[in-house]
């Protein structure tokens, strides 16, 4: 089975190092508890950028020190990653797990290629 997860192919981060994208998952029923994880893939290496669990009653809540923020609406999650620099350019995969009620489902998006360009330093003005 598995679950279909859709996310944009490419996103360009803002000059402030902020990138936003929507992660949408296909679910036949209404999941009471959902976990969303953003993974960064660099070659064969996979690292967790951030993760959050939300319920029908509660809004999506990342840890206070997380680089991510987000909101949820039905089967869509609006994700924002902050503090990005040029070296963070890469493929960001949205992983969705329907934790409750049974059955458990996991779904992986194909990844969003986030391009980050460091801003040019402002020239000194006399």
């Amino acid at each position: 089975k598995g679950m279909h997860v859709a996310q944009p192919a490419v996103v360009l981060a803002s000059s402030r190092g902020v990138a936003s994208f929507v992660c949408e998952y296909g679910s036949s029923g209404n999941a009471a508890e959902v976990r969303v994880t953003v993974l960064r893939q660099a070659g064969s290496q996979m690292t967790e950028v951030c993760a959050a669990t939300y319920t029908v009653e509660d809004e999506l809540a990342f840890l206070d020190d997380s680089t991510c923020t987000g909101t949820s609406s039905g089967n869509k999650v609006n994700l924002t990653i902050q503090g990005l620099r040029a070296m963070d350019t890469g493929l960001y995969i949205c992983k969705v797990e329907l934790m409750y009620p049974p059955p458990y489902y996991v779904g992986m998006g194909n990844g969003t290629q986030i391009y980050v360009i460091d801003p040019e330093p402002c020239p000194d003005s006399d």
Epitope: R35, L39, M99, Y105
Partner: antibody
Framework: QVQLVESGGGVVQPGRSLRLSCAAS????????MHWVRQAPGKGLEWVTF????????YYADSVKGRFTISRDNSKNTLYLQMNSLRAEDTAVYYC???????????WGQGTLVTVSS | EIVLTQSPGTLSLSPGERATLSCRAS???????LAWYQQKPGQAPRLLIY???SRATGIPDRFSGSGSGTDFTLTISRLEPEDFAVYYC?????????FGQGTKVEIK
């Protein structure tokens, strides 16, 4: 490096209980879901049970539902399997396994043998 | 529950030959959620392939996976002596997690 080490196996009589442990090291334990998988002598792999990151969500195979309980202590980096009302058909090597980022079981312990016999 | 059926049960081949193992699912499995494992006697299973065709870290390129929907294949292009073992397919997209019954690759 990632390591999973099971312990607690042994010989036990039918109807009795046993508790298995799986000590994890080399990774952030709380960031991964975990499983127990068993293998009866000369047989294939059978998934037994799953536990979520925080331990709030648990799933069981029908064959062990109501008898086995999975739990975890993230502060001790340890996974547990409490096995009650053991039967002869529960005789197997029990493996703990980590769920990789993309879903497959990427690391396994060496296994611990549980023999249920009178 | 998704039932996985592997064939053949046993494959008798010589080193250097090509091995083709089949895994058929009772219902569609997204290709992102199909894995292959290798198990040698007295050892724990080892992840070979995930997402139907991606090799796990450290797995030699003679191992390859293919397929989608309900039919999946593990191919070992040229069997090395250390490849003789039992191979299991697994679906991990939904609970309950299920394994095939295994295919034993033995020396002819």
């Amino acid at each position: 490096q990632v390591q999973l080490v099971e312990s607690g196996g042994g010989v036990v009589q039918p109807g009795r209980s046993l508790r298995l442990s799986c000590a994890a090291s080399g990774f952030t334990f709380s960031s991964y879901t975990m499983h127990w998988v068993r293998q009866a002598p000369g047989k294939g792999l059978e998934w037994v049970t799953f536990i979520s990151y925080d331990g709030n969500n648990k799933y069981y195979a029908d064959s062990v539902k109501g008898r086995f309980t999975i739990s975890r202590d993230n502060s001790k980096n340890t996974l547990y399997l409490q096995m009650n009302s053991l039967r002869a058909e529960d005789t197997a090597v029990y493996y703990c396994a980590r769920t990789g980022w993309l879903g497959p079981f990427d690391y396994w312990g060496q296994g611990t043998l549980v023999t249920v016999s009178s | 529950e998704i039932v996985l059926t592997q064939s053949p049960g046993t494959l008798s081949l010589s080193p250097g030959e090509r091995a083709t193992l089949s895994c058929r699912a009772s219902q569609s499995v997204g290709s992102s959620y199909l894995a292959w494992y290798q198990q040698k006697p007295g050892q724990a299973p080892r992840l070979l392939i995930y997402g139907a065709f991606s090799r796990a870290t450290g797995i030699p390129d003679r191992f390859s996976g293919s397929g989608s929907g309900t039919d999946f294949t593990l191919t070992i292009s040229r069997l090395e002596p250390e490849d003789f073992a039992v191979y299991y397919c697994q679906q991990y997209g939904s609970s309950p997690w299920t394994f095939g019954q295994g295919t034993k690759v033995e020396i002819k």
